[in-house]
Interface confidence: low
């Protein structure tokens, strides 16, 4: 379920690279503070090639007896990434990929980057952070979006093709106006779609046809003036 | 030897308490041990009461004994309470303590349990 | 809350028979389940944590295996000494950690 009382901040880094954060300020803490560790897990859409910063519950650092970040990857082991204060000890075990890493000392700060994210990052991230008080959770179920590559021709007599080529999840197609709609998924061994539709117009006054791809990280309206002449193509890329 | 010991059956009646303690010994009582209390009534399942974090005194109780129970800790004596007030007969159960430290060894421990009778 | 339903509620089975015992979880708990065995007048004993890791010194005819909401626990090859009731228990979050309802384990 997503955790509404989160805002997702999005900064131009140097590097370039859009930088996406689910923590909070300090004031934003001691103001929702109990609903914070109320909402254990939170849905989090992400954008690949960007930089992700996961946050541990609000709890303060000195109250820590062991920080442990469980990181669950399809078709992987369990990964975790082990703090305990007493010994100022880190255990990494499962761990192979060297983008997800701490974002300074455990000790420090208990936060977890992910420079870039790739498709592979799809899965739940989980922080469990034991204190004197108890075991507080907060996890992420990461879900690493994929702009879809768009395409739009015409392929046949008052017939137009509209592309979403790998994206992830899946774009939806729609048409203005409505013709005799087919479309198709093909799925991708690396977790992205790419949806086709394929409509006929019969109606001869209509000349100009819009498709419309809606994706998560984004809309996008593409138009064709559709030729009477067979075969002809026109990208509208 | 580690182990909870608890105190002794208790009969009471109804609208009454009662306290149960649970009594740590062989291992250090301290901060990252919660100590939970569960209760199991006559021929039925396990049910789980709340528990209190050792070095805190911080607490959790299920939703069902809300504002009805009470838990407590004697670090001097390593000893855990749990109160339970406006007893009814459906209270009549055997009371558990358990230790948990943490999602590393959950659980791992048990009292041998305190048989508590509600009756009129 | 997270709820927990355990199934079956009874099993009659012979000995060196495999017994399986299945506990689902209303909502995710990755892999924060426990798997209790208790007989009767005594308290439960911890078999399993974290869905599949054996607790100390319980035999390894006893296993566990799930994640997320459907876990599983298997006795191969049952003895007499196994008759009891079993209970798997969310461990989650620490706000919260019920016990499924029980399934009785008896020997023909």
């Known amino acids: 379920q997503p955790n509404n009382s989160l805002m997702l901040q999005t900064s131009k880094e140097n590097h370039a690279l859009a930088s996406s954060s689910l923590c909070m300020d300090e004031k934003q803490i001691t103001q929702n503070y109990s609903k914070v560790l109320a909402e254990v897990n939170t849905s989090w859409p992400v954008k690949m090639a960007t930089n992700a910063v996961l946050c541990c519950p609000p709890i303060a650092l000195r109250n820590l007896i062991i920080i442990t970040w469980e990181i669950i990857l399809r078709g992987q082991p369990s990964c975790t990434k082990a703090y305990r204060k007493e010994t100022n000890e880190t255990k990494e075990t499962n761990c192979t990929d060297e983008r997800i890493t701490w974002v300074s000392r455990p000790d420090q700060n208990s936060d977890l980057q992910i420079r870039p994210v790739a498709i592979t990052h799809d899965g739940y991230y989980r922080c469990i952070m034991v204190t004197p008080d108890g075991n507080f959770h907060r996890g992420y179920h990461l879900q690493v979006l994929v702009t879809p590559e768009l395409t739009l021709f015409q392929n046949r007599n008052r017939t137009a093709v509209c592309k979403a080529v790998a994206g992830k999840p899946a774009a939806q197609i729609s048409w203005i106006p409505e013709g005799d709609c087919a479309t198709k998924q093909e799925y991708w061994s690396n977790g992205t779609v790419t949806v086709k539709s394929t409509c006929h117009w019969e109606v001869h006054n209509v000349s100009t046809v819009t498709c419309h791809v809606s994706h998560l990280t984004g809309n996008k309206s593409l138009y064709i003036e559709l030729l009477p002449v067979p075969g002809a193509k026109k990208s509208a890329k | 030897q580690v182990q909870l010991v608890q105190s002794g059956a208790e009969v009471k009646k109804p609208g009454a308490s009662v306290k149960v303690s649970c009594k740590a010994s062989?291992?250090?009582?301290?901060?990252?041990?919660?100590m939970a209390w569960v209760r199991q009534a006559p021929g039925q399942g396990l049910e789980w009461m709340g528990l209190i974090g050792v070095g805190s005194g911080s607490l959790w109780y299920a939703q069902k004994f809300q504002g009805r129970v009470t838990m407590t800790r004697d670090t001097s004596t390593s000893t855990v309470y749990m109160e339970l007030s406006s007893l009814r007969s459906e209270d009549t159960a055997v009371y558990y303590c358990?230790?948990?430290?943490?999602?590393?060894?959950?659980?791992?421990?048990w009292g041998q349990g305190t048989l508590v009778t509600v009756s009129s | 809350e997270i709820v927990l339903t355990q199934s079956p509620d009874f099993q009659s089975v012979t000995p060196k028979e495999k017994v399986t015992i299945t506990c689902q979880a209303s909502?995710?708990?990755?892999?924060?389940l426990l798997w209790y065995q208790q007989k009767p007048d005594q308290s439960p004993k911890l078999l399993i944590k974290q869905a599949s890791t054996l607790a100390s010194g319980v035999p390894s005819r006893f296993s566990g295996s799930g994640s997320g909401t459907d876990f599983t626990l298997t006795i191969n090859s049952l003895e007499a000494e196994d008759a009891a009731t079993y209970y798997c228990q969310n461990y989650y979050d620490i706000s919260s950690n019920d016990f499924g309802g029980g399934t009785k384990v008896e020997i023909k």
């Open positions: 909502e995710s708990i990755d892999s924060y």
């Open positions: 358990a230790r948990h430290f943490a999602l590393s060894d959950p659980f791992n421990l």
């Open positions: 062989g291992f250090s009582f301290s901060s990252g041990y919660y």
